[in-house]
C-alpha cells in the first residue's frame, strides 16, 4: 500500500540500527572516495530527518521519494566535482535520471588501498571503546570497495564480525581466536560479493526475465517439492528484492527481503521440509540461512521429463499458448530433477530446448524434429562435467597455489593483453574453486564449480569493459552470461599477440620481499609468472616450472642469507640470465 512518507515507512519497518546501516552502505556505494566521517555525518542527518517524519508524516519534505532525499544529500557534499569529476554532472539531472547516473558511475575497481585488518589488540580496543563506530567503519570500508554488495547480507556479515569480536576480545590470546574466524568471514563475504555482482550484471544487461529464469532454476533445485506456482511466486519476489538492491534501493530491498523470509517461514509446508532451523533464527541470520539452505529431498515419483516436453502431442500448442510459462515449466521440471547441475547449465539446456521448439514447431512434422532434443542435451552436459573432472584432478595434484599458477599460465596465454594485476587476481580467484568445490561430494561439485567460475569471470568482464584490450575477452564477455564460462574455457593461445620484450627490472627483486606475508609473496611470484608468459606465450609447462622452481630457490636462499641485500643484488642478475636461457 502507498505510504504518505516513504522514509518514515522504511524507518519503522527496519528499525533504527538497520536503517542507519543501510543508509551508510548506500552512501558508501555511491560515493566511494568519501571518508567514513563524511558519510557518518550524512547518515545522522538522514536518520534525524526520518525521525521527524515518523513523528509527523506531513512534515516538510517527508513525502519525497528516497532517491530524491538521498540524491539531494549526496549532491550537497562540498567539493563534489573536485573529488568525483563527472559524477557531479549527475546532480544537474532530475530523478529518476539522477539515480541512474549515480549507478553508472559506480566503480567496480576503485583505486583504494586494500582493506588492512589492524592487529588484534588495537582492534579490540577500538571495538570496546565504540562498537557502533567500529561496525560503521566495517560497513563503510566493505561497501565502498564493493559497490554492489548485497546490502542486507552485508549487515549480516557485520553482525558476524561483531559476534566474533565480542567473543575473541574477551580471550587471552585474541590473535589466534580472531584470525581464523575473521578470515572465514572475509572469504565468505568476498564470494558473496562476486555472486551478487553477477546477479546485478544479469539484471543490468539482460533484464528481469533473465534474472527470474536464474531464480526459477535455483529455487526449483532447492525446493523440488514446491509446485510451479509457488516457485514462480518466490522467483518473482526474489527478482524484486535483487532489482531493488542492484538499483541502489537498499531500504526497500532489505525490507522486501525480510518480507520474503517471513513468507517462506509461514509457508514451509508448501515450500520445503528443510526450513525450520533457519526460521528459528533472528532476521539477518534467518534470511542468510534461507539463502543457502540445503536442498529438500526430491519427490520419489517424478515422471520422466520427456512425457510432457517431448512425447505429449500438445508440445507446440502449449508452447504457442504461453511461451514463457511453458519454458518456465520446463526449466522448473528439469531443475528440480537435477540438483547436481549448475544453474548456468540448466539455463543453457532451457535455451537449447527453446531454440529447438522455435525451429521444430515451425516445421510440418514437429514431433519428428523435436523428438531427439533430450539426446542433444548430452554434449552440453558432458562439457562442464569434463571441466570439473579435469580441474579437480589438477587441483588435487598441485594444491591451491600450484593450481592457481596453472590457471594463470592458461589465462595469460588466452588473453596476454590483459593487465598482469587483473590476470593475477582472476587466476587466484579462479584457483580457489579447487579448495571451495573439489572437496565436496560428487553431486555437489558441478554446481559449485561452474556457478563460482561464472561469477569470477563476470568480474573479469567488468574490469575488461573499463579498458578493453583483448578481442578474445571482448568476444566471450559480449555473449549471454550463461555462455561465458564455456567460451573462456574454449579459448586457446592468442596467436595475434606480439610477445613482450624481456625487461630485467620486471624480474628484479629486493630483500623487502622476505618480510612480506605469504599471500603477498605469492602475488609477487605470480606477477613474475604472468610476465614470463607474456614474454614467451608458447613456453612449455616444463620450461615455466624450471624457471619458477629456480625463482623459488633464489628467494629461499637470499631470504635466509645473513646479508640479504648483497645476496639479492648478486644472485638476482644470475637468476635473470638463467631465466632467459631456460626460455630461449
Amino acid at each position: 500500500e502507498a505510504h504518505k512518507s516513504e522514509i518514515a515507512h522504511r524507518y519503522n519497518d527496519l528499525g533504527e540500527q538497520h536503517f542507519k546501516g543501510l543508509v551508510l552502505i548506500a552512501f558508501s556505494q555511491y560515493l566511494q572516495k568519501c571518508s567514513y566521517d563524511e558519510h557518518a555525518k550524512l547518515v545522522q542527518e538522514v536518520t534525524d530527518f526520518a525521525k521527524t517524519c515518523v513523528a509527523d508524516e506531513s512534515a516538510a519534505n517527508c513525502d519525497k521519494s528516497l532517491h530524491t532525499l538521498f540524491g539531494d544529500k549526496l549532491c550537497a557534499i562540498p567539493n563534489l566535482r573536485e573529488n568525483y569529476g563527472e559524477l557531479a554532472d549527475c546532480c544537474t539531472k532530475q530523478e529518476p535520471e539522477r539515480n541512474e547516473c549515480f549507478l553508472q558511475h559506480k566503480d567496480d575497481n576503485p583505486s583504494l588501498p586494500p582493506f588492512e585488518r589492524p592487529e588484534a589488540e588495537a582492534m579490540c580496543t577500538s571495538f570496546k571503546e565504540n562498537p557502533t563506530t567500529f561496525m560503521g567503519h566495517y560497513l563503510h570500508e566493505v561497501a565502498r570497495r564493493h559497490p554492489y554488495f548485497y546490502a542486507p547480507e552485508l549487515l549480516y556479515y557485520a553482525e558476524q564480525y561483531n559476534e566474533i569480536l565480542t567473543q575473541c576480545c574477551a580471550e587471552a590470546d585474541k590473535e589466534s581466536c580472531l584470525t581464523p574466524k575473521l578470515d572465514g568471514v572475509k572469504e565468505k563475504a568476498l564470494v558473496s560479493s562476486v555472486r551478487q555482482r553477477m546477479k546485478c550484471s544479469s539484471m543490468q544487461k539482460f533484464g528481469e526475465r533473465a534474472f527470474k529464469a536464474w531464480a526459477v532454476a535455483r529455487l526449483s533445485q532447492t525446493f523440488p517439492n514446491a509446485d510451479f506456482a509457488e516457485i514462480t511466486k518466490l522467483a518473482t519476489d526474489l527478482t524484486k528484492v535483487n532489482k531493488e538492491c542492484c538499483h541502489g534501493d537498499l531500504l526497500e530491498c532489505a525490507d522486501d527481503r525480510a518480507e520474503l523470509a517471513k513468507y517462506m517461514c509461514e509457508n514451509q509446508a508448501t515450500i520445503s521440509s528443510k526450513l525450520q532451523t533457519c526460521c528459528d533464527k533472528p532476521l539477518l541470520k534467518k534470511a542468510h540461512c534461507l539463502s543457502e539452505v540445503e536442498h529438500d529431498t526430491m519427490p520419489a515419483d517424478l515422471p520422466a521429463i520427456a512425457a510432457d516436453f517431448v512425447e505429449d502431442q500438445e508440445v507446440c500448442k502449449n508452447y504457442a499458448e504461453a511461451k514463457d510459462v511453458f519454458l518456465g515449466t520446463f526449466l522448473y521440471e528439469y531443475s528440480r530433477r537435477h540438483p547436481d547441475y549448475s544453474v548456468s547449465l540448466l539455463l543453457r539446456l532451457a535455451k537449447k530446448y527453446e531454440a529447438t521448439l522455435e525451429k521444430c514447431c515451425a516445421e510440418a512434422n514437429p514431433p519428428a524434429c523435436y523428438g531427439t532434443v533430450l539426446a542433444e542435451f548430452q554434449p552440453l552436459v558432458e562439457e562442464p562435467k569434463n571441466l570439473v573432472k579435469t580441474n579437480c584432478d589438477l587441483y588435487e595434484k598441485l594444491g591451491e597455489y600450484g593450481f592457481q599458477n596453472a590457471i594463470l599460465v592458461r589465462y595469460t596465454q588466452k588473453a596476454p593483453q590483459v593487465s598482469t594485476p587483473t590476470l593475477v587476481e582472476a587466476a587466484r580467484n579462479l584457483g580457489r574453486v579447487g579448495t571451495k568445490c573439489c572437496t565436496l561430494p560428487e553431486d555437489q561439485r558441478l554446481p559449485c564449480v561452474e556457478d563460482y567460475l561464472s561469477a569470477i569471470l563476470n568480474r573479469v568482464c567488468l574490469l575488461h569493459e573499463k579498458t578493453p584490450v583483448s578481442e578474445h575477452v571482448t568476444k566471450c564477455c559480449s555473449g549471454s552470461l550463461v555462455e561465458r564460462r564455456p567460451c573462456f574455457s574454449a579459448l586457446t593461445v592468442d596467436e595475434t599477440y606480439v610477445p613482450k620484450e624481456f625487461k630485467a627490472e620486471t624480474f628484479t627483486f629486493h630483500s623487502d620481499i622476505c618480510t612480506l606475508p605469504e599471500k603477498e609473496k605469492q602475488i609477487k611470484k605470480q606477477t613474475a609468472l604472468a610476465e614470463l608468459v607474456k614474454h614467451k606465450p608458447k613456453a612449455t609447462a616444463e620450461q615455466l616450472k624450471t624457471v619458477m622452481d629456480d625463482f623459488a630457490q633464489f628467494l629461499d636462499t637470499c631470504c635466509k642469507a645473513a646479508d640479504k641485500d648483497t645476496c639479492f643484488s648478486t644472485e638476482g642478475p644470475n637468476l635473470v640470465t638463467r631465466c632467459k636461457d631456460a626460455l630461449a
Epitope: Q313, K317, A320, C361, A362, E363, A364, P366
Partner: nanobody, 115 residues
C-alpha cells in the same frame, strides 16, 4: 489465449469439392506448423495433413494424397484445406491443430459426403 475457428464444412456429393478455413489468433501464427485432423463418427482422431510455418513444406496422409491440398496465408493468420474428389469415407468433423497434435481444442467443422 490461443483460438482456432474452423469453417467451410457442409454437405457435398461424392466427387465434389470443399474448401475449409481455420482462423487462428492468440499466437504468432507464422512461427508454427499447422495440421488438419479429422474424426469420423465413432472413430478415433486421424491426421490428415500438415504444413510448415512458412508454407514451404507439406505432408499428407496416404488416404488423401493427390486429392487434398493444404495451404496457409500468414498475412491473414488463416489455414486452408482444399478438398477435391470427396468420398463418403471423408465424412468427419475436421479440426485444425498446432504442430502435429491429434488433440482437438476447437469446435471443428462437419464435412458430410453423401449422395
Amino acid at each position: 489465449k490461443v483460438q482456432l475457428v474452423e469453417s467451410g464444412g457442409g454437405l457435398v456429393q461424392p466427387g465434389g469439392s470443399l474448401r475449409l478455413s481455420c482462423a487462428a489468433s492468440g499466437f504468432t501464427f507464422s512461427s508454427f506448423g499447422m495440421s488438419w485432423v479429422r474424426q469420423a463418427p465413432g472413430k478415433g482422431p486421424e491426421w490428415v495433413s500438415s504444413i510448415s510455418g512458412s508454407g514451404s513444406d507439406t505432408l499428407y496422409a496416404d488416404s488423401v494424397k493427390g486429392r487434398f491440398t493444404i495451404s496457409r496465408d500468414n498475412s491473414k493468420n488463416t489455414l486452408y484445406l482444399q478438398m477435391n474428389s470427396l468420398r463418403p469415407e471423408d465424412t468427419a468433423v475436421y479440426y485444425c491443430t498446432i504442430g502435429g497434435s491429434l488433440k482437438q481444442s476447437s469446435q471443428g467443422t462437419l464435412v458430410t459426403v453423401s449422395s
